[in-house]
Structure formats: structure tokens, C-alpha cells
């Protein structure tokens, strides 16, 4: 039994449409069939849950309908996309992976991805 390691990029720049994508990769110590992935946001010392999804290995991630996250999985990699981001959402986004089934349970927490969001400049009035 070894503790689980989770890797994610250090920095990601959101697109002008407020979309940020990053890969969360975990080194699974066991053969999990059910995995829970949670995206956490850390601002100052406060940690909040952005979104969470549980998936069966080989199947798609299913976030809640009103979630700002979408994702796909491939083996021990999860491709996460966060939408609707604004400049005020700039911060550290942590990928948390839990191997839920079969036992034993394992926890893995990444070091976080700093997502920078720049609000687009408003379009200047056009003179016609």
C-alpha cells in the first residue's frame, strides 16, 4: 500500500471565453473500478468545492447538470474543463482523486493548478 500521487499542471491560462482545461493524472496503487474526482478552489486559506464527479473506469465522467465542469477520462488520466470563468475566479484549482471501489480507499490530492482568467475587453462602439 503506497499513498497515491496526483499530478496536474502548475499554470493554465483560461481562454477569452472563460474556459480552462487541464489534465489531472493519478498513479493508482490499486485496480479501482469507481473513482471520484473533485475540483477544489483554494483562495487565501479557504477551500471550496467547485465540482465533483464519480465515474466507473472506462466510462465518462458525469457531473451534475448545473455544474461548470465537464470532463473525460482515459485510464488514470482525467481531462477537466471549467467553464464560465471570470477574472475574479483566478486562483488555485486543486484536483482531488478518491479511489472509492473496490476497497481499500485511497486519497490523492494534487498541488493545484493556478488558473489565470482575464476578462475580455469590451468591444469599442463601431461608427457606421
Amino acid at each position: 500500500c503506497k499513498a497515491m500521487h496526483v499530478a496536474q499542471p502548475a499554470v493554465v491560462l483560461a481562454s477569452s471565453r472563460g474556459i480552462a482545461s487541464f489534465v489531472c493524472e493519478y498513479a493508482s496503487p490499486g485496480k479501482a473500478t469507481e473513482v471520484r474526482v473533485t475540483v477544489l478552489r483554494q483562495a487565501d486559506s479557504q477551500v471550496t468545492e467547485v465540482c465533483a464527479a464519480t465515474y466507473m473506469m472506462g466510462n465518462e465522467l458525469t457531473f451534475l447538470d448545473d455544474s461548470i465542469c465537464t470532463g473525460t477520462s482515459s485510464g488514470n488520466q482525467v481531462n477537466l474543463t471549467i467553464q464560465g470563468l471570470r477574472a475574479m475566479d483566478t486562483g488555485l484549482y486543486i484536483c482531488k482523486v478518491e479511489l472509492m471501489y473496490p476497497p481499500p480507499y485511497y486519497l490523492g490530492i494534487g498541488n493545484g493548478t493556478q488558473i489565470y482568467v482575464i476578462d475580455p475587453e469590451p468591444c469599442p462602439d463601431s461608427d457606421f
Epitope: 477544489l40 485511497y106 490523492g108
Partner: antibody, heavy 118, light 107 residues
Framework: QVQLVESGGGVVEPGRSLRLSCAAS????????MHWVRQAPGKGLEWVAV????????DYADSAKGRFTISRDNSKNTLYLQMNSLRAEDTAVYYC???????????WGQGTLVTVSS | EIVLTQSPGTLSLSPGERATLSCRAS??????LAWYQQKPGQAPRPLIY???SRATGIPDRFSGSGSGTDFTLTISRLEPEDFAVYYC?????????FGPGTKVDIK
């Protein structure tokens, strides 16, 4: 603010059963794993059981397997520990604790004392 | 099962002194190690998580360090309210285990 309040402790004879409850408030109960931890008089902390987000996802310490059952009612924001076939060595203060978003036990109840004695 | 060993069992110090508590794991924990403080008749209180991050409301005289299997909790200057029992815990792998505790008492 987050609050966890245990109840259901008391004096019980060996071989009998007891059900502990932990009433949670101040957070979205269904989004967190919940643990039971116990502490025998004058001893250290011993993890007993955990129940995760889905009620089917549970784990137990070896000392609790087969005798204790952890459950939760998300509609009532309540955690339970059903303890059967109690032994003298189960005498302890039982705490419920929340598994925080970063994994450690970030909030604890005040504890409820279970005494198993004839 | 991961076994956590704490030393010393008891640490006798005076207010204002520095306290150094050790926790050793039987296998690598990555960073899934926490420290809790417990006073008589009270529930444990989280101090440190993720080896070195302070929990909410914990003063900066408490600090955690270490990696792999060896971890340390340091109290830079003991205040009267710091005399208590301190437990380390690993929370990354089932079963979740606690160390036996270190009692910090007044010399």
C-alpha cells in the same frame, strides 16, 4: 457554523447493542465523508469507521468489522453507528468527525461516552 | 496498515520554550499527514494538515514539516494553553491511523 452533536451513549451490558447518532448542521452534509473515532479512557485515538458520499461506500477498522454498522440519512443530516455484540473493550468516548475537502478530519463532535459493563 | 510512531511519549517543558514532536510512519505517506491537539475532556482539534498547512485559526507558532516517513510538529514558543496531547494521523490510505500521542506537560 459547522456543528456535530453526538448522542446515544450510555451504560450497556456485554453482548447488547447500542445506536449512536451524530446530528450535523452548518454544511452540506451529503457532500462530505463522515467518520467515527473512539478513545478508550486514558488511551489514544482509534479510527472506527467511515461512510462516504454514497451510503454504500463504507470502511471499518478490523475491531469494528462484523459488529458495527455505519450509516447516514442525508435527508436528516444525521450519521449513525449501530454497535452490536458489545464488549468491555468497546468502552470509550465515541466522536463523529467530518472528512474535510482536503481529507483531514476538520470538525469533530464533543463525543458520547459508551460504557460496556455487567 | 500504516503504523505511526510518536516520540517522545512525554515532553516536559516550560512556557516560552520550543517543542519538537516527532512522528514516524511505517511507509511513505506522501503528504497525507495531519496533527491534532487534545486537551482533557475535549475533542481533538486539527492543527496541521498536508504535513505543513495550518488549519483555520491556528496560530503561526505551530508549524509542521517532513516528508516520506518522518514528520515533525514544532511549537516555536510554548504558551500556557499549548500543554496538551498531540496526535499525528495519516488520512491517505485505509485504515486511517493515529499515532499513540505525545503529551506536552509543564516542567
Amino acid at each position: 457554523q459547522v456543528q456535530l452533536v453526538e448522542s446515544g451513549g450510555g451504560v450497556v451490558e456485554p453482548g447488547r447493542s447500542l445506536r449512536l447518532s451524530c446530528a450535523a448542521s452548518g454544511f452540506t452534509f451529503s457532500s462530505y465523508g463522515m467518520h467515527w473515532v473512539r478513545q478508550a479512557p486514558g488511551k489514544g485515538l482509534e479510527w472506527v469507521a467511515v461512510i462516504w458520499y454514497k451510503s454504500s461506500e463504507k470502511d471499518y477498522a478490523d475491531s469494528a468489522k462484523g459488529r458495527f454498522t455505519i450509516s447516514r440519512d442525508n435527508s436528516k443530516n444525521t450519521l449513525y453507528l449501530q454497535m452490536n455484540s458489545l464488549r468491555a473493550e468497546d468502552t470509550a468516548v465515541y466522536y463523529c468527525a467530518r472528512a474535510g475537502l482536503l481529507g483531514y478530519f476538520d470538525y469533530w463532535g464533543q463525543g458520547t461516552l459508551v460504557t460496556v459493563s455487567s | 496498515e500504516i503504523v505511526l510512531t510518536q516520540s517522545p511519549g512525554t515532553l516536559s517543558l516550560s512556557p516560552g520554550e520550543r517543542a519538537t514532536l516527532s512522528c514516524r510512519a511505517s511507509q511513505s505517506l506522501n503528504s497525507y499527514l495531519a496533527w491534532y491537539q487534545q486537551k482533557p475532556g475535549q475533542a481533538p482539534r486539527p492543527l496541521i494538515y498536508g504535513v505543513s498547512s495550518r488549519a483555520t485559526g491556528i496560530p503561526d507558532r505551530f508549524s509542521g514539516s517532513g516528508s516520506g516517513t518522518d514528520f515533525t510538529l514544532t511549537i516555536s514558543r510554548l504558551e500556557p494553553e499549548d500543554f496538551a496531547v498531540y496526535y499525528c494521523q495519516q488520512y491517505g490510505i485505509y485504515p486511517f491511523t493515529f499515532g499513540p500521542g505525545t503529551k506536552v506537560d509543564i516542567k
